[in-house]
């Protein structure tokens, strides 16, 4: 069954067929003998009952009030009444944009990631039996598609697919031609799911230290939730009892990615800790990134250009 008109506030464009369907339709069929009435109120007019004689543009069928077509003066409040059931809608009819094939107020925006599945399907189940043909336009230029009853686009999105897609259904009623437009604003964006992880700061860091003292080497990265960050040093990690990997800290960024940092703590620095590489690596499905730290005795600092030092 076609969805009933559940939203209490509706905006429609002048000149298009339109319908209101109340939401107790199944109930109404059960109580065939019950009086069912449609009313309109607008401005000074209070609850005027609607019937086919009210206007040649209005039709009543079972659960539905139809407009052929809806016009600006149809703006107002509409009521359906049956026994102790009432449903109310506030209808706002707006002007058609004469300079475009669609009206901006009637746009549905969708964002699609590049290379992900993207579809536009031109369907209108309520008017389906009356539709002669349907055309699909992109940025108001007609697309030549095989099916002129329900034109469809189904593909993996490319950046060139971005634009305004308008489905225009052409239908006949009582010898007159009408059309109904449904427009989608499609924006194609980069893959939002994963980033290439990156280590923050220079790739090579010389750290000035004193023998017998302690040092903390901080490795920070911007990464995805499933990515890992780890330290590598010496022949075998963990062979030096003075070297400790601290617990990894993670903070979520506003974009849903992670800022991670992992500290390597070297206590009681000895000669064996100098001039060797302490490598920090971030690894993901998309690859790895590594940065290196070298401990240098303070006395030897003069031999190395100043810009390569970190503290």
């Amino acid at each position: 069954a076609e969805s009933c008109t559940s939203r209490p506030h509706i905006t429609v464009v002048e000149g298009e067929p339109f319908y209101l369907k109340h939401c107790s339709c199944s109930l109404a069929h059960e109580i065939e003998t019950t009086t069912k009435s449609w009313y309109k109120s607008s401005g000074s007019q209070e609850h005027v009952e609607l019937n086919p004689r009210s206007s040649s543009r209005i039709a009543l069928h079972d659960c539905v009030l139809e407009f052929w077509p809806v016009e600006l003066n149809d703006t107002g409040s509409y009521f359906f009444q049956m026994k102790n059931y009432t449903q109310k809608w506030k209808l706002n009819v707006i002007r058609r944009n004469k300079h475009s094939c669609f009206t901006e107020r009637q746009v549905t925006s969708k964002i699609v990631e590049v290379k992900k599945f993207f579809q536009i399907t031109c369907e209108n189940s309520y008017y389906q039996t009356l539709v002669n043909s349907t055309s699909l336009y992109k940025n108001c230029k007609k697309l030549l598609l095989e099916n002129n009853k329900n034109p469809t686009i189904k593909k993996n999105a490319e950046f060139e697919d971005q634009g305004y897609y308008s489905c225009v259904h052409f239908l006949h009623h009582n010898g007159k031609l009408f059309n109904i437009t449904k427009t989608f604003n499609i924006t194609i964006v980069e893959d939002r799911s994963n980033i290439v992880p990156v280590l923050l700061g220079p790739k090579l860091n010389h750290v000035a230290v004193e023998l017998g003292k302690n040092v903390r080497l901080n490795c920070s990265a911007l990464l995805n939730e499933e990515d890992v960050i780890y330290w590598m040093f010496g022949e075998e990690n963990g062979s030096d009892p003075n070297i400790h990997e601290e617990k990894e800290m993670r903070i979520m960024t506003p974009e849903g990615k992670w800022h991670a940092s992992k500290v390597l703590r070297i206590e009681n620095i000895g000669e064996s800790n100098l001039n060797v590489l302490y490598n920090c690596t971030v690894a993901s499905t998309g690859g790895t990134d590594t940065k290196s730290f070298i401990l240098v005795r303070k006395a030897d600092m003069a031999d190395i250009p100043g810009h390569v030092f970190t503290r």
Epitope: S6, R7, H9, R105, S109, K110
Partner: antibody
Framework: QVQLVQSGAEVKKPGASVKVSCKAS????????MHWVRQAPGQGLEWMGT????????YYNQKFQGRVTMTRDTSTSTVYMELSSLRSEDTAVYYC??????????????WGQGTTVTVSS | EIVLTQSPGTLSLSPGERATLSCRAS??????????MHWYQQKPGQAPRLLIY???NLETGIPDRFSGSGSGTDFTLTISRLEPEDFAVYYC?????????FGQGTKLEIK
């Protein structure tokens, strides 16, 4: 007229997943977009994402990308929101809510009663 | 992403007074004469309730002491004469573009 009825409260351990359901009243399901909004204790409202039940199109807030999945079952007029890799900061009340599909109509005039999800070890 | 900033964070007033709540968007949420900004009221333990849609339209069943105004980036929710039941948290929300977003809220408390 539309009513949204959500599943009951959940208690989960960190790292687990939770799946919350939201059933819409008859006849209205495919014509409205469904959204999920959460509210941590004492905090504001946070929009998580949306699903268009007519074609299953989804769009998620980047903050939840990769952890959240929204699905629908048109036969039962139900939408689902699954959140994985739960952390303590995911403890919140999760609301489903409905809007029109036009951009201008994406305001929330009907809300579910809320589902409390507690993440605790 | 459009960021909404509400001010003040907390507003202390007495019943009968006029309340003015502000919401500023990081970019325009208006187009072709419509402003895609909406306002909600939330009381403790309850789901939010729509008050105003499209900047200035009063939701059905909401008292007419509530009104909304503004366009572009600056919007205002006004409660002309505060009733005891109006003390709650108020949120603005934009639908100009995805992702949809809410302001951080303004708490309206009794002075």
């Amino acid at each position: 007229q539309v009513q949204l009825v959500q599943s009951g409260a959940e208690v989960k351990k960190p790292g687990a997943s939770v799946k919350v359901s939201c059933k819409a009243s008859d006849y209205t399901f495919t014509s409205n977009w469904m959204h999920w909004v959460r509210q941590a204790p004492g905090q504001g409202l946070e929009w998580m994402g949306t699903i268009d039940p007519s074609d299953s199109y989804t769009y998620y807030n980047q903050k939840f990308q990769g952890r959240v999945t929204m699905t629908r079952d048109t036969s039962t007029s139900t939408v689902y929101m699954e959140l994985s890799s739960l952390r303590s900061e995911d403890t919140a009340v999760y609301y489903c809510t409905t809007s029109g599909d036009y951009d201008a109509d994406r305001y929330f005039d009907v809300w579910g009663q809320g589902t409390t999800v507690t993440v605790s070890s | 992403e459009i960021v909404l900033t509400q001010s003040p964070g907390t507003l202390s007033l007495s019943p009968g007074e006029r309340a003015t709540l502000s919401c500023r968007a990081s970019k325009s949420v208006s187009t072709s004469g419509d402003s895609y900004m909406h306002w909600y009221q939330q009381k403790p333990g309850q789901a939010p309730r729509l008050l105003i849609y499209l900047a200035s339209n009063l939701e059905t069943g909401i008292p007419d002491r509530f009104s909304g105004s503004g366009s572009g980036t600056d919007f205002t929710l006004t409660i002309s004469r505060l009733e005891p039941e109006d003390f709650a948290v108020y949120y603005c929300q934009q639908s100009r573009e995805l992702p949809l977003s809410f302001g951080q809220g303004t708490k309206l408390e009794i002075k």
